[in-house]
Interface confidence: low
């Protein structure tokens, strides 16, 4: 059975957190990606961006977990206006920025 | 209110043993990850040790491992510190805190008591 | 283990802005917490998750976090904000809490 969205959130939460505190080198080789407008449409707006990274193996339980909350297929390539225009920032940031922004949200009760 | 009080300190002699107490009130004590934190006289902060919300795990300063054990009641509302074979350098103040648990251990400590005194000397 | 690397002191005018420094390796990559320390009292919590701020803490109060370096910045400075300053940040390779050595913000 589905878990439920808070136990989703808190499980990719908590994969967000295993990846900051774990880093002993630059995420993904210190790839850039294309930063997101926290705002609305989190979720596939994340996974949009990061599924550009392909072969980093450190964030692929991310994107998995991301998919998981994303209710259209995302393909790489693709990008809403979501995206903050001509603004990349390395992977580290961008997964430490989403895993202050969920934190929030989980704060709040927002789990869908 | 929300609260933390901490009792036990006292002075004792070199390689003595001390426990000190951690009581709390104002809040949901078992959902809380709880931490130990010393400051000897006129300097910094320095952690000492951690106990899971639900007792499963306890991680210590490299410092005190071996010597100190953390435990908590959750029916009590109590937090313990058992120090065995005190040194001179483990006078200070100690405080005890709480740290969100579902965070696991990256949270910050949002609540700490006004800490008690230990003093080791012969 | 990981080490966190304040400058002993920090003095500004009332007024004035107080930049504080946390240094780390990849500091940028964790999640770093601010404490203020009062002479007698025990530590209070005033910038967590690297820029947030408790509700009761003032707006002036303020941080960031990237590279190696995480700053508190305090601006308009009053003479109450006169105190001891910690950073913390929990560090997985050990499993241990570690904190910064301390800063002390004097308001001349």
């Known amino acids: 059975s589905p878990v439920p969205p808070s136990t989703a959130l808190k499980e990719l939460i908590e994969e967000l957190v295993n990846i900051t505190q774990n880093q002993k080198a630059p995420l993904c080789n210190g790839s850039m990606v294309w930063s997101i407008n926290l705002t609305a449409g989190v979720y596939c707006a994340a996974l949009e961006s990061l599924i550009n990274v392909s072969g980093c193996s450190a964030i692929e339980k991310t994107q998995r977990m991301l998919n998981g909350f994303c209710p259209h297929k995302v393909s790489a390539g693709q990008f809403s206006s979501l995206r903050v225009r001509d603004t990349k920032i390395e992977v580290a940031q961008f997964v430490k920025d989403l895993l202050v922004h969920l934190k929030k949200l989980f704060r709040e009760g927002q789990f869908n | 209110q929300m609260q933390l009080v901490e009792s036990g300190g006292g002075v004792v002699q070199p390689g003595r043993s001390l426990r000190l107490s951690c009581a709390a009130s104002g809040f949901t004590f078992r959902t809380y990850g709880m931490h130990w934190v010393r400051q000897a006289p006129g300097k910094g902060l320095e952690w000492v040790a951690v106990i899971w919300y639900d007792g499963s795990n306890k991680h210590y300063a490299d410092s005190v491992k071996g010597r100190f054990t953390i435990t908590r009641d959750n029916s009590k509302n109590t937090l313990n510190l058992q120090m065995n074979s005190l040194r001179a350098e483990d006078t200070a103040v100690y405080y005890c805190?709480?740290?969100?648990?579902?965070?696991?251990?990256?949270?910050?400590?949002?609540?700490w008591g006004q800490g008690t005194m230990v003093t080791v000397s012969s | 283990s990981y080490v966190l690397t304040q400058p002993p002191s920090v003095s500004v005018a009332p007024g004035q802005t107080a930049r504080i420094t946390c240094g780390g390796n990849?500091?940028?990559?964790?999640?770093v917490h601010w404490y203020q320390q009062k002479p007698g009292q025990a530590p209070v919590l005033v910038v967590y998750?690297?820029?947030d701020r408790p509700s009761r803490i003032p707006e002036r109060f303020s941080g960031s976090n990237s590279g190696n370096t995480a700053t508190l910045t305090i601006s308009r400075v009053e003479a109450g904000d006169e105190a001891d300053y910690y950073c913390q940040v929990w560090d997985s390779s050990s499993d241990h809490v570690v904190f910064g050595g301390g800063t002390k913000l004097t308001v001349l």
């Open positions: 805190a709480r740290a969100p648990q579902w965070m696991l251990v990256a949270e910050a400590f949002d609540l």
């Open positions: 998750d690297d820029s």
């Open positions: 990849l500091i940028g990559s964790k999640l």
